[in-house]
């Protein structure tokens, strides 16, 4: 007699063959925060931006990624105090004088308005208010985001 | 009516509420190998290591941490062709002046034996032999995983 | 939009050169590794060369190795093939092409329309 | 370089035909295996990948199985829409090497 958790082990089994879909999260892992169809992740501890990047790689997810100005805004307004910064997956790419996203993309000018220089070692915060751009080597807090909703698997025949 | 993947999430999120786990992954996705409880992508493009941890990243998944020589061992049965390097989630800390796992351990010296040298800008590969000590800006192969079964929430409430 | 625009193809006489251009949008190019497959007229496809993401790494089929060089330029999000010592096998239909996955070569799932080059004296 | 052959080089079929495509690698790929439909003065297109993944998009009267060294590339249900030019594709090693092509006329 199969429990309900190992007969879901092979519906949801059945269902990603047929649609090369994983199951996701269905539901946000505990101290996570839903946001639409994310899963957000505050720190409470600092560490430059290289660590934080790695903290959230070994949490299988990926520093904040943020698609507009509206997303922005919905994430800052999770954020308590006006004071806290908080890493995101944004840092500055020397090579390609530009700002560029963990995931490759490179930041639309008209998404965030950033204070501070882009240079060599700059790395993106947010706070409640605003956006930041700070040395790498600071030590902040940091938001890991995990997409929430079953994702088709395109990154995975991806890497 | 609900379909059987609906009725699984409302079952497996009964089922988190009871254990504080999370689903995890039921079984690997395409083109991931399974090696015990971890789902392994080994790529077959190249990168420097950094761009390495935000592949992994940006596929919720991690830069390869190996527990033990026994777990070295059967991953380097995994790789076909002797000349291949990978690199994993382990680079030197010039800070610590130590080997460090992207998940903020550091290596237990009897785990792998080094070739080459602990310095700056120093990131680990593996190959089917040997593990080795490159420049991070060599450009390799590389490593994912992803945790297989479903883990205890214990990285979490730490940050 | 995602999409690959290839341009540079022309005629060309033997022994000649030719610098084609592959311009990339709507997906994150710095993170793939890209190829370029020709197809001579009435003919298969043709795997000719590679480039890793960062640029650091190239390959190239037997048939182009020495003549022909990969490069790109990620801030513009261009793919390059410099064709030099052409010769009239080397005409063709050259494509760009993305993988499917920044961890793979091939698998391509996004193909440009093509970009002719003739080798004709 | 890994070979790939594909048989038959062109195939005669009617709409609502089951058609079967086969690819040979001359040394084993796991499934490191992809299929193209390419139409004329057209890229190629992406149907199948990893030997028996349905690209998204693609209909599921294309089926791809196989793995190692023979592969297969089944059409269902031929539709108008489905004549064309055919190519498998290896992805295990460089340098990437695809097939000669299978035509599918129309009877």
């Known amino acids: 007699q199969k429990s309900s958790i190992e007969k879901c082990s092979v519906d949801i089994q059945q269902s990603r063959n047929k649609t090369t879909e994983r199951p996701g999260l269905l539901n946000c892992p505990i101290y996570w925060q839903q946001l639409r169809e994310k899963c957000l992740l505050f720190s409470h501890t600092v560490n430059p931006w290289n660590n934080s990047l790695a903290d959230c790689s070994t949490k299988e997810s990926s520093l904040l990624l943020i698609r507009d100005k509206d997303e922005l805004i919905h994430t800052q307004n999770l954020i308590r105090d006006k004071a806290i910064l908080f890493w995101i997956g944004l840092n500055f790419s020397l090579s390609e004088k530009n700002w560029k996203w963990i995931n490759g993309s490179f930041l639309n000018s008209n998404d965030l308005e950033i204070r501070g220089d882009a240079k060599e070692n700059s790395c993106i915060s947010i706070s409640q208010t605003s956006v930041y751009s700070e040395y790498c080597s600071t030590e902040i807090r940091w938001i890991c985001q995990k997409e929430l909703t079953p994702v088709r698997n395109k990154v995975y025949p991806d890497s | 009516q609900k379909s059987s993947i609906e009725k699984c999430s409302v079952d497996i999120q009964q089922s988190r509420n009871k254990t504080t786990e999370r689903p995890g992954l039921l079984n690997c996705p395409i083109y991931w190998q399974q090696l015990r409880e971890k789902c392994l992508l080994f790529s077959h493009t190249v990168n420097p290591w950094n761009n390495s941890l935000a592949d992994c990243s940006t596929k919720e998944s991690s830069l390869l941490l190996i527990r033990d020589k026994d777990e070295l061992i059967h991953t380097q049965n995994l790789i076909r062709d002797k000349a291949i390097l990978f690199w994993i989630g382990l680079n030197f800390s010039l800070s610590e002046k130590n080997w460090k796992w992207i998940n903020g351990s550091f290596l237990n010296s009897n785990d792998l034996e080094i070739r080459g040298d602990a310095k700056e800008n120093s990131c680990i590969s593996i190959s089917q032999t040997s593990v080795y000590s490159e420049y991070c800006s060599t450009e390799i192969r590389w490593i994912c995983q992803k945790e297989l079964t479903p883990v205890r929430n214990k990285v979490y409430p730490d940050s | 939009e995602v999409q690959l625009l290839e341009s540079g193809g022309g005629l060309v006489q033997p022994g000649g050169s030719l610098r084609l251009s592959c311009a990339a949008s709507g997906f994150a190019f710095s993170t793939y590794a890209m190829s370029w497959v020709r197809q001579a007229p009435g003919k298969g496809l043709e795997w000719v060369s590679a480039i890793s993401a960062a640029g650091g790494t190239t390959y190239y089929a037997d048939s182009v190795k020495g003549r022909f060089t990969i490069s790109r330029d990620n801030s513009k999000n261009t793919l390059y093939l410099q064709m030099n010592s052409l010769r009239a096998e080397d005409t063709a239909v050259y494509y760009c092409a993305k993988p499917l996955d920044s961890s793979l070569w091939a698998d391509f799932d996004l193909w440009g329309r093509g970009t002719l080059v003739t080798v004709s004296s | 370089d890994i070979q790939m052959t594909q048989s038959p080089s062109s195939v005669s079929a009617s709409v609502g035909d089951r058609v079967t495509i086969t690819c040979r690698a001359s040394?084993?790929?796991?499934?490191?295996l992809a299929w193209y439909q390419q139409k004329p003065g057209k890229a190629p297109k992406l149907l199948i990948y990893a030997a028996s993944s349905l690209q998204s998009g693609v209909p599921s009267r294309f089926s791809g199985s196989g793995s190692g060294t023979d592969f297969t590339l089944t059409i269902s249900s031929l539709q108008p829409e489905d004549f064309a030019t055919y190519y498998c594709q290896q992805a295990s090693v460089l340098p990437i090497t695809f097939g000669g092509g299978t035509k599918v006329e129309i009877k």
């Open positions: 040394q084993g790929i796991d499934s490191w």
